[in-house]
Amino acid sequence: QQQTLPKPFIWAEPHFMVPKEKQVTICCQGNYGAVEYQLHFEGSLFAVDRPKPPERINKVQFYIPDMNSRMAGQYSCIYRVGELWSEPSNLLDLVVTEMYDTPTLSVHPGPEVISGEKVTFYCRLDTATSMFLLLKEGRSSHVQRGYGKVQAEFPLGPVTTAHRGTYRCFGSYNNHAWSFPSEPVKLLVTGDIENTSLAPEDPTFPADTWGTYLLTTETGLQKDHALWDHTAQNLLR
């Protein structure tokens, strides 16, 4: 006899990286007929929702109107059908960004390189942080973590046209509190036409959409919550 229900999916909209003082919604998707959802924060009960009518709703949304460092951390959710509770969802790491300072991102040998060249990004921040994160815009979650007193190196190795795109970096004050994003650096990788056609670029977005777009599009996020849980969030573990 089944003792628990399948775990729900948890995700954040528009994104798990939330600029301070901005709003975020934590979504929990369980099953139709669930009479209660519970959101837990760092192991403690944070919020409760009872959808009405439960038989027509399989997802609830928990609103955080004003993101700050005290709200950043690990969230999970569970739901109940009758007296039977679900397994807990995967952990959602909610990150507050735009804290304190802005790092500087540079690339060596430069932003325009030939396929096969070795490329290294450098992220520098002169305040008290030793962890840095390099992110490539696009639906895929290209995230690298680096360490250094005031600067981290991110060697990409010999690049291909798949490395083309717009990069930004963050300084991380702890796992859930990140700096402002750096100014974007667009990496252009030239190769022969045949190779280029075989390595399409990730869908990228204009720089001014960064604030709402960040690592992934909302639609991409909604299409596969499980995949999202296991990719972009893994850097925080």
Epitope: F41, V48, D66
Partner: nanobody, 127 residues
């Protein structure tokens, strides 16, 4: 922000009842999910009861379930906590709190979810 003022506390014998009120000034309470917390000397602040914006949904922990009832009158901008069968363990300062939310059904149980707090009202239950 919303200003919150609690009242209704006092000294009561074990087994008695009290009704706490929390009046909001300036802004409409309909914008907020509301909650009651309490803090006894030397202990952490503890969630006691929460209610959704519309008042349709409430939640209380097992420690007070069946004894404490939270309700709200959005027309009057008032939040209530009806406390029955009081015990000496219920002695504490009781605080009401408000959390701005778009959701009609969210109830917040964690103090970090609440942005606005009252000054508190003392409830003392004697044996």
């Amino acid at each position: 922000q919303v200003q919150l003022v609690e009242s209704g506390g006092g000294l009561i014998q074990a087994g008695g009842s009290l009704r706490l009120s929390c009046v909001a000034s300036e802004r409409s309470l309909t914008l907020y999910a509301m909650g009651w917390f309490r803090q006894a000397p030397g202990l952490e602040r503890e969630f006691v009861a929460g209610i959704s914006r519309t008042g349709d949904t409430t939640y209380s922990p097992d420690s007070v379930k069946g004894r404490f009832t939270i309700s709200r009158d959005n027309a009057k901008n008032v939040l209530y906590l009806q406390m029955n069968s009081l015990k000496p363990d219920d002695t504490a300062v009781y605080y009401c709190a408000a959390s701005a939310t778009y959701s009609a059904t969210n109830i917040y149980t964690h103090q970090r979810a609440y942005g606005d707090w009252g000054q508190g009202t003392q409830v003392t239950v004697s044996s």
